[in-house]
């Protein structure tokens, strides 16, 4: 069945039941997604407008799918797999009483089992089961997923990273030799090189030894910290800057106005929330856009998607991903992939990694 | 590439009965929702009936509820449309569509067949 | 029960024209609203999913807007192909239909 190719998932509470406090609701279902974050690699926000990946609702009889309620009883709620749309969207059947206690039918209890549905999960045969078809109530101060919960969820998504790379908790500026040392965006901007990481980049002239520290904020005031992407189209002079569904141009290392703009007037379904990376070919005047495990390819002179796309990074980039931090292009035949604190200098002509390098292996570690 | 293909079409006489057949091809047909849509001549687009990955959900439109049964053999990559006491209204192509989804339906149809026509008429 | 007001039935206009047809549902049906494409002849085919979405290899000309009731799908520069006929459509029900005409 689908799962989500991400694990950074937002959802938003459509409306509000009346049977609860606005903010039990709240609670309720953010304790629910935290008892599968728990157990997996996922990471669930709430937000408050825009396009979620999970829409959770409160609605009676017909609704807007083909799968109308029942009135009290019976169907309780429903969610659909993950996926664009209306996928993993989470519905609640307003006409029963929503509770956060025994009485009534318990919110908290009947979200766990909707958001397994959301995550990708079908029903357990296991009547100790979270996921089991009918509902019970058991003690929600005491609540734990059975063994099938975590087996089924963890079949989809894996454990929890002890090892995941946390944001710098104070900002300070990173250790630039630490041998876990990652970047989040890479590009090069004329014969330079800028390595963004939080809110510094390292500036690398093309080979000379010397590299420095900068705050992104110093060069570009306007600009926010945290770039995720970057590329540059060099001989137009730009270079541009992503950030969550936004994006910056600089040309000639200056900010242009009218400037930030959404990422989906690339052509971006809704879906994509985020770049992870991206790089400028200009043997072949295509940007290639890395989301996930998924890779987008468009075409800068006819400013438009290729069509086909996305596709499996893992299936085109022998040994690469399947999810990338950075890529930047170099000597007209590399792109330099980096992955956590690892980098891989993939020569897009032989279509394979030729070398494998440490990340900071730029600034003589 | 995907590929929906109807078949049985044709005229019936009022009261008669009908039964459709879509072939499917170039996906995996068993986890989908399956559907079919009409169109009478010069009309719009009107939902008819849908069904579900394992045969056993069904919807159907008000117009045609207790006279068309629709059903699909997974093995055979097969979706149908048993058309019983048909009326003269019941005259349109009919489209078979794939549901771009599994286990509950979206509504939302990414691939669709080129149509079959059923005429109603004495 | 659901219903898709779609307008208008019919429209005029001439390539390279920016063209807006509107759906309206009569209760909130969230961004479950979906868009189709149908030439003469033709089966009808996919053009945006969940309100804003494009469907894969649909010309970027073509976007959708709106939620809860009110939903637009707009042409930004007609192109001779457009000409077609437009549905809204949200589970069971479709609007009844906007042809687009060349003027």
């Known amino acids: 069945g689908p799962v989500w190719r991400k694990h950074y998932i937002t959802y938003r509470i459509n409306n509000y039941t009346p049977d609860m406090n606005r903010e039990d609701v709240d609670y309720a279902i953010r304790k629910a997604f935290q008892v599968w974050s728990n157990v997996t690699p996922l990471k669930f926000s709430k937000i408050n407008t825009g396009m979620a990946d999970i829409l959770v609702v409160f609605a009676r009889g017909a609704h807007g799918d083909f799968h109308a309620f029942d009135g009290k009883g019976g169907i309780l709620a429903h969610a659909f797999g993950p996926g664009s749309g209306i996928g993993g969207d989470a519905h609640f059947d307003e006409d029963e009483f929503w509770t956060t206690h025994s009485g009534g039918t318990n919110l908290f209890l009947t979200a766990v089992h909707e958001i397994g549905h959301s995550l990708g999960l079908g029903h357990s045969s296991d009547p100790k089961a979270v996921m089991f078809p009918t509902y019970k109530y058991v003690d929600i101060n005491t609540f734990r997923l059975s063994a099938d919960d975590i087996r089924g969820i963890q079949s989809l998504y894996g454990d929890p990273k002890e090892n995941q790379r946390l944001p710098n908790p104070d900002n300070s500026e990173p250790a630039l030799c630490d041998p876990n040392l990652s970047f989040d965006a890479v590009t090069t901007v004329g014969n330079k090189i800028f390595f963004f990481k939080d809110r510094f980049f390292w500036l690398k002239v093309s080979e000379r030894p010397k590299t420095s520290v900068n705050l992104i904020s110093s060069l570009w005031p306007t600009l926010p910290s945290g770039i995720e992407a970057a590329y540059e189209i060099e001989a137009r002079n730009q270079v541009f800057l992503f950030k969550d569904d936004k994006y910056w141009l600089i040309s000639n290392l200056r900010p242009e106005p009218n400037y930030p703009k959404s990422i989906h007037s690339f052509g971006f379904p809704n879906f994509v929330k985020k770049i992870d990376a991206a790089v400028f070919n200009p043997r072949f005047y295509r940007t290639y856009f890395f989301v996930d495990n998924q890779y987008w390819r468009y075409d800068e002179r006819r400013q438009m998607m290729d069509p086909g796309y996305p596709k499996l990074i893992t299936k085109n980039f022998q040994g690469i991903g399947p999810k990338i931090d950075a890529v930047f292009y170099s000597k007209n035949k590399y792109y330099y992939f980096f992955q956590g604190s690892n980098q891989f200098e993939y020569d897009f002509l032989l279509q394979r990694i030729t070398k494998t390098l440490k990340s900071n292996s730029w600034f003589g570690c | 590439e995907v590929q929906l293909l109807e078949s049985g079409g044709g005229l019936v006489q009022p009261g008669g009965s009908l039964r459709l057949s879509c072939a499917a091809s170039?996906?995996?047909?068993?986890?989908?929702?399956m559907h079919w849509v009409r169109q009478a001549p010069g009309k719009g687009l009107e939902w008819v009936s849908g069904i579900g990955p394992s045969g056993g959900l069904t919807f159907y439109a008000d117009s045609v509820k207790g006279r068309f049964t629709i059903s699909r053999d997974n093995s055979k990559n097969t979706l149908y449309l048993q058309m019983n006491s048909l009326r003269a209204e019941d005259t349109a192509v009919y489209y078979c569509?794939?549901?771009?989804?599994?286990?509950?339906?979206?509504?939302?149809?990414?691939?669709w067949g080129r149509g079959t026509l059923v005429t109603v008429s004495s | 029960d659901i219903q898709m007001t779609q307008s208008p039935s019919s429209l005029s206009a001439s390539v390279g024209d920016r063209v807006t047809i509107t759906c309206r549902a009569n209760q909130s049906i969230y961004t479950y609203l979906n868009w189709y494409q149908q030439k003469p002849g033709k089966a009808p085919e996919l053009l945006i999913y969940?309100?804003?979405s494009l469907q894969s290899g649909v010309p970027s000309r073509f976007s959708g807007s709106g939620s809860g009731t009110d939903f637009t799908l707009t042409i930004s520069s007609l192109q001779p192909e457009d000409f077609a006929t437009y549905y809204c459509q949200q589970a069971g029900i479709f609007g009844q239909g906007t042809k687009l005409e060349i003027k």
């Open positions: 569509a794939k549901d771009i989804r599994g286990a509950y339906s979206s509504g939302l149809f990414d691939y």
């Open positions: 170039g996906f995996t047909f068993s986890p989908y929702w």
């Open positions: 969940a309100a804003s």
